[in-house]
């Protein structure tokens, strides 16, 4: 996160850290807890690393430096990448992770509400992006979970800023015209959440941007409301009956 500040304990209890353990262990992506056994993240996090066994998912944590070999983590039972996601395109950058064992909810570890299907009428004015990603383009992973308040921008405006790309209706953009605040490398898959009528909702999944926090280059997020049918289909068919945080 560029231009952000430190988060507090329990402020974003749905935020998880997706880490890979090969020779060393490192944080690669963020994700959002959406049910006892489900995490929503970006499909591109798994490019080149589709093996379930190498991943460790840490929930209920604030500081990555607090993780030791004794820190509990979740393992992956199943990775469900959107069937239309292609490595050669930037569309449908969404994936579900089914955890091997369900998580108990606590003050520091609980799910985010999902939006209503095809939610286009709600005007979100209080949106935040969180993650442990770089604090500048050529930076490094941060220890303490960062947060930043960023306004949504229209898809029309976003398309003007990204003429070389196709900004679809299944994407949502956020950023300041002058730049300075944005997600960055390592924040991928994490949440863009907006507070509406006193409730936090998962509006976007951190997907991509041209650099980080550059002027007139908003961040682009996968629009969760556009994938509600897919999310419900996959979680219910896998679970029988999904333990989901119901759409608001």
């Amino acid at each position: 996160i560029v231009g952000g500040t430190n988060s507090s304990w329990g402020e974003w209890p749905w935020q998880v850290s997706l880490q890979v353990k090969l020779t060393a262990q490192r944080h690669l992506c963020g994700g959002s807890l959406i049910g006892h056994q489900w995490v929503l993240t970006a499909a591109h996090c798994f490019d080149g690393l589709p093996l379930q066994d190498v991943w460790r998912i840490y929930s209920g944590i604030l500081n990555l430096s607090d993780i030791t070999k004794d820190t509990p983590f979740s393992q992956i039972k199943e990775i469900i990448i959107h069937q239309n996601y292609k490595v050669s395109e930037g569309n449908h950058d969404i994936a579900l992770i089914k955890l091997q064992a369900p998580l108990n909810y606590t003050e520091f570890q609980k799910p985010i509400c999902l939006p209503s299907k095809g939610d286009t009428s709600t005007i979100y004015t209080n949106c935040w992006v969180t993650g442990w990603g770089f604090s500048k383009e050529k930076g490094e992973i941060q220890n303490i979970l960062q947060k930043v308040n960023i306004p949504l921008v229209t898809n029309e405006e976003c398309q003007k800023r990204y003429q070389d790309y196709k900004i679809t209706q299944r994407m949502v953009c956020a950023g300041y015209k002058e730049g300075g605040k944005d997600a960055c490398k390592g924040d991928s898959g994490g949440p863009l959440v907006c507070k509406h009528n006193g409730m936090w909702r998962l509006v976007g999944i951190t997907s991509w941007g041209e650099g980080c926090a550059r002027r007139e280059q908003p961040g682009v997020y996968t629009k969760v409301a556009e994938y509600m049918d897919w999310i419900l289909e996959k979680t219910q068919s896998s679970d029988g009956k999904a333990q989901m945080q119901s759409p608001a």
């Epitope: 569309n91 003429q163 070389d164 196709k166 924040d187 980080c212």
Partner: antibody, heavy 125, light 108 residues
């Protein structure tokens, strides 16, 4: 299966014009940036131009700027290169290529993942 | 413009040997925008590596890419007869997009 098929090459006199076409199939053409690359006989590869998915944004190499025009017709899945004021140094095999733009570590990637077989343009009197 | 300089110009090796090809850029290039292509006589180029180190679909694992910033490398761990060709690096980090001049890998 992704396929790109160029046509329109041939022999043309200096100062003349030629229009190359590239017929695309096997993918959603309107989602992809497309590019032209050329290769003079016995030489290396030279990027010529690219066009955005909508066709609203185009960029050219300095060597062809003002003489060549790239365009596309998404309804026909076809890419074009209009070449005017041709010179001897434009003699080359012209390839069209699809520009893949995936995502890695919250940044976009960019590379030419599929190429046509090429069409030869010879500029000579 | 960003100039890509490949070395050596020609590499003479025998099948089974290891080939190391270098590509240096005149300015910083984001790894995501660095690719390697193989070209055989009379054929169109073929994508080998994208994002500096990711193998394209169907490319054997004897091909690997590495590097960052201004220094990139393509390695062929054990040359097969079909690997003798010309190899190009290419950047699309900034326009004009540019290619290296190529490295020819020939049979010794």
């Amino acid at each position: 299966e992704v396929q790109l098929l160029e046509s329109g090459g041939g022999l043309v006199q200096p100062g003349g014009s030629l229009r190359l076409s590239c017929a695309a199939s096997g993918f959603t053409f309107s989602h992809y940036l497309m590019t032209w690359v050329r290769q003079a006989p016995g030489k290396g590869l030279e990027w010529v131009s690219y066009i955005s998915p909508s066709g609203g944004h185009t960029i050219y190499a300095d060597s062809v700027k003002g003489r060549f025009t790239i365009s596309r017709d998404n309804s026909k899945n076809t890419l074009y290169l209009q070449m005017n004021s041709l010179r001897a140094e434009d003699t080359a095999v012209y390839y069209c290529a699809r520009v893949a733009r995936g995502i890695a570590a919250r940044s976009r990637t960019s590379y030419f993942d599929y190429w046509g077989q090429g069409t030869l343009v010879t500029v000579s009197s | 413009e960003i100039v890509l300089t490949q070395s050596p110009g020609t590499l003479s090796l025998s099948p089974g040997e290891r080939a190391t090809l270098s590509c240096r850029t005149s300015q910083f290039v984001n790894s995501n925008y660095l690719a390697w292509y193989q070209q055989k006589p009379g054929q169109a180029p073929r994508l080998l590596i994208y994002g500096a180190s990711s193998r394209a679909t169907g490319i054997p694992d004897r091909f690997s890419g590495s590097g960052s910033g201004t220094d990139f490398t393509l390695t062929i761990s054990r040359l097969e007869p079909e690997d003798f060709a010309v190899y190009y690096c290419q950047q699309s980090s900034r326009t004009p997009w540019t290619f290296g001049q190529g490295t020819k890998v020939e049979i010794k």
